[in-house]
C-alpha cells in the first residue's frame, strides 16, 4: 500500500513552513545588516572555523546520533537538518532583537551565527525525546518555542545574574534535556501492538548513530570553548574537554561491558556515554586547572551515563513514552546537572577558602540560575507539548510512530528498507 503524508498535512506543512520562511526573509530584510568593518582575513577564517565546527556537530553529529531506529533513520537525520536550518535563522533574529535592537538594526557577525547555532543545538538535543512521534509541522512549532524560550532565558540570566555568554549558554544541556522530557511527557505515550519493532535499533542505522557520536566527540572541545573571551580560557576549555571526553569513552565502553551479564557492550550506552565528559565539564571547562581533574570528571560522567542508560530507560519508557534508544534526554539532564553542581562546588570551595560572604552570595545566584533554567525548560516544554497535541498539526497516528514511510518517498516501499 502506498505510504504518503495524510492529505491534510500535505496542505498544512508546506504552507506553514513556507509562510514562516517568507516572514523570516522579511524580518531579515527590514531589521538586519552585515557587520561592515574590514577584518583581518586570517582572523576571519579562524573565527569561521569555530562556527563550522558547531555546524558539523549539529548537522552531522546530532543528526546521525538520533538515527539509530530501524525504520526512522532518514527522518531523524533530515528532520534534524530542517530544525537546525530553521532554528539558526530564528535564533539570529531573536538574539539580535533581545540584545541589539535599540540601535535600530541587528548586526550579523560570525559570532552571532555561532551563538545562533548553539541555540539551535538545544532543539536538536531536546527533539531526541520526541522524534518518531511528531511530524515536521509539529517540529516547526517546537523549534520556534524552544529557541524563543532559550533566548529569553539567556537574556534574563544575563540581566539578573550578570552572567557572560559562556556561562549562560552552558545551561543549554539542562534546559534542552528538561524541555525535551516535558514535551515527551505531553505526547501520547503507549506504543500500540505491532509497532514494537520500529523503535528497535538496527545495525546500519546504529553505525550511523556511532558516526554521529564520533563527530560530536571530535568537536565537543569547540562547543565548550566557542564563547570564551580570551585565548587562555579557550585553551584550557579545549584541553579539559578533550581529557574529559577521552576518559568518558574508556569508561563508557568498559562500564557498558561491566553492566552486561555476559560482559557485552551496548551500542546505546556507548552512543551517549562517549559524550558524557564533554557535557559534565561544560560549565567549568575553562576553570579546571589540571588534566587529572578533568579526567576524574570524565570518569564520573561516564559511569553516571552508563548507570543512567541501564536503569532509567524503563522508567522513561513507562512515564514519558521515550524509547530505550532515545537516551539523550535523561543522559543530558543528569550530566548537565552534574556539570552545574561541579561549578557550584567550585564556588563553595571558594567560600570555604575565603570566608567571604560575597562568594556565598554568588553560590546562591548560581543555584538561582540553575533553578530558573529548569523551571523555564519545564514550563516552556509543557506549553510546547500542549501545542503539539492540537489537532491542527495532524500528528502521526500511534501506529505510524517511528516510520520513515509516513514521511518519505521510497521507490520500492519494502518493509525492511
Amino acid at each position: 500500500m502506498s505510504s504518503k503524508y495524510p492529505r491534510s498535512v500535505r496542505r498544512c506543512l508546506p504552507l506553514w513552513a513556507l509562510t514562516l520562511e517568507a516572514a523570516l526573509i522579511l524580518l531579515f530584510y527590514f531589521f538586519t545588516h552585515y557587520d561592515a568593518s574590514l577584518e583581518d582575513q586570517k582572523g576571519l577564517v579562524a573565527s569561521y572555523q569555530v562556527g563550522q565546527d558547531l555546524t558539523v556537530m549539529a548537522a552531522i553529529g546530532l543528526g546521525f546520533l538520533t538515527s539509530s531506529f530501524r525504520r526512522h533513520s532518514w527522518s531523524s537525520v533530515a528532520f534534524n537538518l530542517f530544525m537546525l536550518a530553521l532554528g539558526v535563522q530564528w535564533a539570529i533574529l531573536l538574539d539580535g532583537f533581545l540584545s541589539q535592537f535599540p540601535s535600530g538594526k541587528v548586526v550579523i557577525t560570525l559570532f552571532s551565527i555561532r551563538l545562533a547555532t548553539m541555540s539551535a543545538l538545544s532543539v536538536l538535543i531536546s527533539v531526541d525525546a520526541v522524534l518518531g512521534k511528531v511530524n515536521l509541522a509539529q517540529l516547526v512549532v517546537m523549534v520556534l518555542v524552544e529557541v524563543t524560550a532559550l533566548g529569553n532565558l539567556r537574556m534574563v540570566i544575563s540581566n539578573i545574574f550578570n552572567t557572560d555568554y559562556h556561562m549562560n549558554m552552558m545551561h543549554i544541556y539542562v534546559f534542552a534535556a528538561y524541555f525535551g522530557l516535558s514535551v515527551a511527557w505531553c505526547l501520547p505515550k503507549p506504543l500500540p501492538e505491532g509497532t514494537e519493532d520500529k523503535d528497535q535499533t538496527a545495525t546500519i542505522p546504529s553505525l550511523s548513530a556511532m558516526l554521529g557520536a564520533l563527530f560530536l566527540w571530535m568537536f565537543w572541545p569547540s562547543f565548550n570553548s566557542a564563547l570564551l573571551r580570551s585565548p587562555i580560557e579557550r585553551k584550557n576549555a579545549v584541553f579539559n574537554t578533550y581529557y574529559a571526553v577521552a576518559v568518558s569513552v574508556v569508561t563508557a565502553i568498559s562500564g557498558s561491558s561491566l553492566a552486561h551479564p555476559q560482559g557485552k557492550i551496548s551500542k546505546t550506552y556507548v552512543h551517549s556515554a562517549v559524550l558524557a565528559g564533554g557535557v559534565a565539564v561544560g560549565t567549568s571547562c575553562h576553570l579546571i586547572p589540571s588534566p587529572w581533574l578533568a579526567m576524574v570528571l570524565g570518569l564520573v560522567a561516564g559511569l553516571i551515563s552508563v548507570g543512567g542508560a541501564k536503569y532509567l530507560p524503563g522508567c522513561c519508557n513507562r512515564v514519558l513514552g521515550i524509547p530505550h534508544s532515545s537516551i539523550m534526554g535523561y543522559n543530558f539532564s543528569l550530566l548537565g546537572l552534574l556539570g552545574e553542581i561541579i561549578y557550584i562546588v567550585l564556588l563553595v570551595l571558594d567560600t570555604v577558602g575565603a570566608g567571604n560572604g560575597m562568594i556565598g552570595f554568588q553560590v546562591l545566584l548560581s543555584i538561582g540560575e540553575l533553578s530558573l533554567a529548569i523551571v523555564i525548560a519545564l514550563m516552556s516544554g509543557l506549553l510546547t507539548g500542549l501545542l503539539l497535541n492540537l489537532k491542527i498539526w495532524k500528528a502521526p497516528h500511534e501506529a505510524k510512530y517511528f516510520d520513515d514511510q509516513v514521511f518519505w518517498k521510497f521507490p520500492h516501499l519494502a518493509v525492511g528498507f
Epitope: 583581518d40 582572523g43 540581566n159 555568554y165 585565548p231 579546571i288
Partner: antibody
C-alpha cells in the same frame, strides 16, 4: 616596551564620519582584546567598545551602538574605530586600551582577571559646525 | 541604564588613610564584576592601579589596595602622599550585557 598610539582625531561637522586608528607595539597584539574609551571635556571616562582578540565578537556602549564600529587588523597590529553620524556629544579625547589578560590558579580552579592595563595617550575628536 | 556611583570628592591629609567606594545600581558588587581602579592626573591618560578586585599591577605602589566592602568595591590608600592627588575611576564589568561601565570618578584632594 608596550605602547599604544592613537591617531585620526580632528574637527568634524555633525553627521559626518571619522576613523580612528590605534597602532600597537611591544606585545603580541593578536592575543589581546582591545577597548576604546572616551572622555568628554571636563567629564569622566566612558567606555565605548571592545573587540575580542580574534575579532569574532564586538560590544558597544548604548550611546554609540549602531553608529560606531570597532574593528582590528591583527596582521597590521592596528585597532580601528569607525565613527559615523557624529554628534556634538561625541566630542572627547578617545583612548585605546589593552584588555587585561591574566590568571592565577589554586589546586581546584583557575581565576581569570579582566580589566584594562595599558592605555594610549589619546586623540581628540571635536564635533562642531 | 546601569549606573556606577562613586563619591564625587574626598579630602585626606598627607600620611592619612582614605577609602574610595564604587557601587552598582544593579545591586551588590561581587568579584564577578572584576572591579578595576584607575588614577588620572590632569592632562594625562588614565593609569591602571588595581584589577579584578584586589590585584596590583607591577607599577602600583604598595599603599594602594582593593577590596569588596559591604556590597561595594573599595580602593584604600594608606599613608597618602601628595602625588596621590588625582581623580580615581572605578570600572565594573557587566558580563551579562558584555559591557564595561566606569564610575563618575572621585577627586581626591591631599591637604
Amino acid at each position: 616596551q608596550v605602547q599604544l598610539v592613537e591617531s585620526g582625531g580632528g574637527v568634524v561637522q555633525p553627521g559626518r564620519s571619522l576613523r580612528l586608528s590605534c597602532a600597537a607595539s611591544g606585545f603580541t597584539f593578536s592575543t589581546y582584546g582591545m577597548h576604546w574609551v572616551r572622555q568628554a571635556p571636563g567629564k569622566g571616562l566612558e567606555w565605548v567598545a571592545v573587540i575580542w582578540y580574534d575579532g569574532s565578537n564586538k560590544n558597544y556602549a548604548d550611546s554609540v551602538k549602531g553608529r560606531f564600529t570597532i574593528s582590528r587588523d591583527n596582521s597590521k597590529n592596528t585597532l580601528y574605530l569607525q565613527m559615523n553620524s557624529l554628534r556634538a556629544e561625541d566630542t572627547a579625547v578617545y583612548y585605546c586600551a589593552r584588555d587585561l589578560q591574566g590568571y592565577r590558579s589554586s589546586w581546584y580552579r583557575m581565576y581569570y582577571y579582566y580589566g584594562m592595563d595599558v592605555w594610549g595617550q589619546g586623540t581628540t575628536v571635536t564635533v562642531s559646525s | 541604564q546601569t549606573v556606577v556611583t562613586q563619591e564625587p570628592s574626598l579630602t585626606v591629609s598627607p600620611g592619612g588613610t582614605v577609602t574610595l567606594t564604587c557601587a552598582s545600581s544593579t545591586g551588590a558588587v561581587t568579584s564577578g564584576y572584576y572591579p578595576n581602579w584607575f588614577q588620572q592626573k590632569p592632562g594625562q591618560a588614565p593609569r591602571a592601579l588595581i584589577y579584578s578586585t584586589s590585584n596590583k599591577h607591577s607599577w602600583t605602589p604598595a599603599r594602594f589596595s582593593g577590596s569588596l566592602l559591604g556590597g561595594k568595591a573599595a580602593l584604600t590608600l594608606s599613608g597618602v602622599q601628595p602625588e596621590d592627588e588625582a581623580e580615581y575611576y572605578c570600572l565594573l564589568y557587566y558580563g551579562g550585557a558584555q559591557r564595561w561601565v566606569f564610575g563618575g570618578g572621585t577627586i581626591l584632594t591631599v591637604l
